[in-house]
């Protein structure tokens, strides 16, 4: 699929999307992972689910429905806030924390009815309950009533290291896959390209060994890395040329302090 919107997309009606990429078609990419994602459908003017392959694709792809709506539906934020302030909290906001049956250690948020705040908790990955949000924003919007909580709420801190019995697992080495970390990342203002080009190379979660390329924003070059076949992030290209074409264009030449340690 093309990374640009089709010409025909501009004729779809009066509703203009907030961003040009919202007009792009859903693109599952060439990889074979099966990741539940969301895209904005220009034909229906709604955010819809699709299965993403795990690499490449385009910017019309979101991890959550909420993120998609916020990014691509004009006026959505205002109506969402209005609804939240005027309506009662859904029943599921009052459900107790449920890590679920599985033990996958995922960072999630829930509404704590005692503290009246959204807090971070560890979700096991399957079969919990609906008081379980992928982002703090989503939790606040649905369960923290803005009328009753005018002051900003501090997120309850939890270490990015999750204790598993007596051992401590660093998230970057899950499944014994060491994720290469880029030592230097350009300041956001120095990079105007696709946001995923700033992400570190991510080998993913499976066991294959595929040659891929990622854009190193510190060096401005595309480097080789081994991809395991699923998961990972969008900074993942099948050829060096594709990688450069997608990411190199966004770098703004800065004579002095282009990178931050």
């Amino acid at each position: 699929l093309s990374e640009e919107a089709d010409d025909t997309d501009s004729e779809l009606g009066s509703m203009k999307p907030l961003h040009t990429f919202c007009a792009m078609k859903a693109d599952d990419g060439p990889c074979k992972a099966m990741i539940r994602s969301y895209f904005f459908n220009m034909y229906t003017h709604q955010c819809e689910e699709f299965i993403y392959g795990g690499c490449e694709g385009n910017e019309n792809r979101f991890d959550t429905l909420e993120e998609c709506k916020k990014t691509c539906i004009p006026g959505y934020e205002k109506t969402a806030v209005k609804a939240a302030s005027g309506a009662e909290r859904p029943d599921f906001c009052f459900l107790e924390e449920d890590p679920g049956l599985c033990r996958g250690y995922m960072k999630r948020y829930l509404y704590n009815n005692q503290t009246k705040q959204c807090e971070r908790f560890v979700y096991g990955g399957c079969l919990g309950n609906r008081n379980n949000f992928e982002t703090l924003d989503e939790c606040k919007k649905i369960c923290e009533n803005p009328v009753h909580s005018p002051s900003p709420v501090n997120e309850v801190q939890m270490s990015d290291y999750v204790t598993d019995g007596n051992t401590v697992t660093d998230r970057s080495t899950v499944n014994n896959i060491v994720v290469p970390q880029s030592p230097k990342v350009p300041r956001r203002r120095d990079y105007r390209g696709r946001p995923w080009c700033l992400q570190p190379a991510d080998s993913g979660l499976c066991k294959a060994s595929e040659r891929r390329f990622y854009y190193n924003s510190a060096t401005g070059k595309c480097h080789r890395f081994n991809y395991t076949g699923c998961g990972g992030n969008n900074n993942n290209f099948t050829t060096r040329r594709r990688c450069l074409r997608s990411c190199k264009t966004g770098l703004i030449k800065n004579k002095s302090k282009g990178v931050v340690k």
């Epitope: 992972a33 990741i35 049956l101 033990r103 990955g125 399957c126 079969l127 992928e134 699923c230």
Partner: antibody, heavy 123, light 112 residues
Framework: QVQLQQSGPGLVKPSQTLSLTCAIS??????????WSWIRQSPGRGLEWLGI?????????RYAVSVKSRITINPDTSKNQFSLQLNSVTPEDTAVYYC?????????????WGQGTLVTVSS | DIVMTQSPLSLPVTPGEPASISCRSS???????????LNWYLQKPGQSPQLLIY???NRASGVPDRFSGSGSGTDFTLKISRVEAEDVGVYYC?????????FGQGTKVEIK
């Protein structure tokens, strides 16, 4: 090697309570890497999940809506077992009842099953 | 409830030949990390069910490599590359995307 040994009566009268026990060896009912379930099988309904309990920071349970008002699954940590109680039974509850362990770590699934107990509800 | 529909319900097989069982769910069983919330079980005659495949495509310990699971979204397949006599029994798919946990109605595999 985990083993689940079921015990309980094979015949229950209508309107009475069906009680079964599942004794665990090779694992702990309080393990935070497992969950403990009851599933039944009848010719008419196939495999039907009834409910599950699991211990994390505290005990949790979940029941199928079809039996929610009548079912209780309890752990017995002192004997390392868990039990099923199904109240107000009818002939519709006639089935082979299985206890099973849900593996919570890498292998998400019912990886160990009891031998099954045929329970007939009849007067 | 998520409804799991298997086909065929009965599958006569010839030893040494491949076999394939289909399972369809009434809603998608794929989560954001690419894990598929689907398992396969085999219940041999007179025995309790045993776990064959977990998370859609991973073989449980001790399961021969002639068994493989695949599929995404709502359509899943269990394949046996070369059927052996000991593979007879009823095969079930099961979802754990949401409560209640539900099973397919079963596919009975028997030797021709």
């Amino acid at each position: 090697q985990v083993q689940l040994q079921q015990s309980g009566p094979g015949l229950v009268k209508p309107s009475q309570t069906l009680s079964l026990t599942c004794a665990i060896s090779g694992d702990s009912v309080s393990s935070d890497s497992a969950a403990w379930s009851w599933i039944r099988q009848s010719p008419g309904r196939g495999l039907e999940w009834l409910g599950i309990i699991y211990k994390r920071s505290k005990w949790y349970n979940r029941y199928a809506v079809s039996v929610k008002s009548r079912i209780t699954i309890n752990p017995d940590t002192s004997k390392n077992q868990f039990s099923l109680q199904l109240n107000s039974v009818t002939p519709e509850d006639t089935a082979v009842y299985y206890c099973a362990r849900w593996h919570s770590d890498k292998m998400w699934g019912f990886d160990d099953w009891g031998q099954g107990t045929l329970v007939t509800v009849s007067s | 409830d998520i409804v799991m529909t298997q086909s065929p319900l009965s599958l006569p097989v010839t030893p040494g030949e491949p076999a394939s069982i289909s399972c369809r769910s009434s809603q998608s069983l794929v989560m954001s990390r690419g894990i598929t919330y689907l398992n396969w079980y085999l219940q041999k005659p007179g025995q309790s069910p045993q776990l064959l495949i977990y998370k859609g495509s991973n073989r449980a310990s001790g399961v021969p490599d002639r068994f493989s699971g695949s599929g995404s979204g709502t359509d899943f397949t269990l394949k046996i590359s070369r059927v052996e006599a000991e593979d007879v029994g009823v095969y079930y798919c099961q979802q754990y995307d949401s409560y209640p946990l539900t099973f397919g109605q079963g596919t009975k595999v028997e030797i021709k």
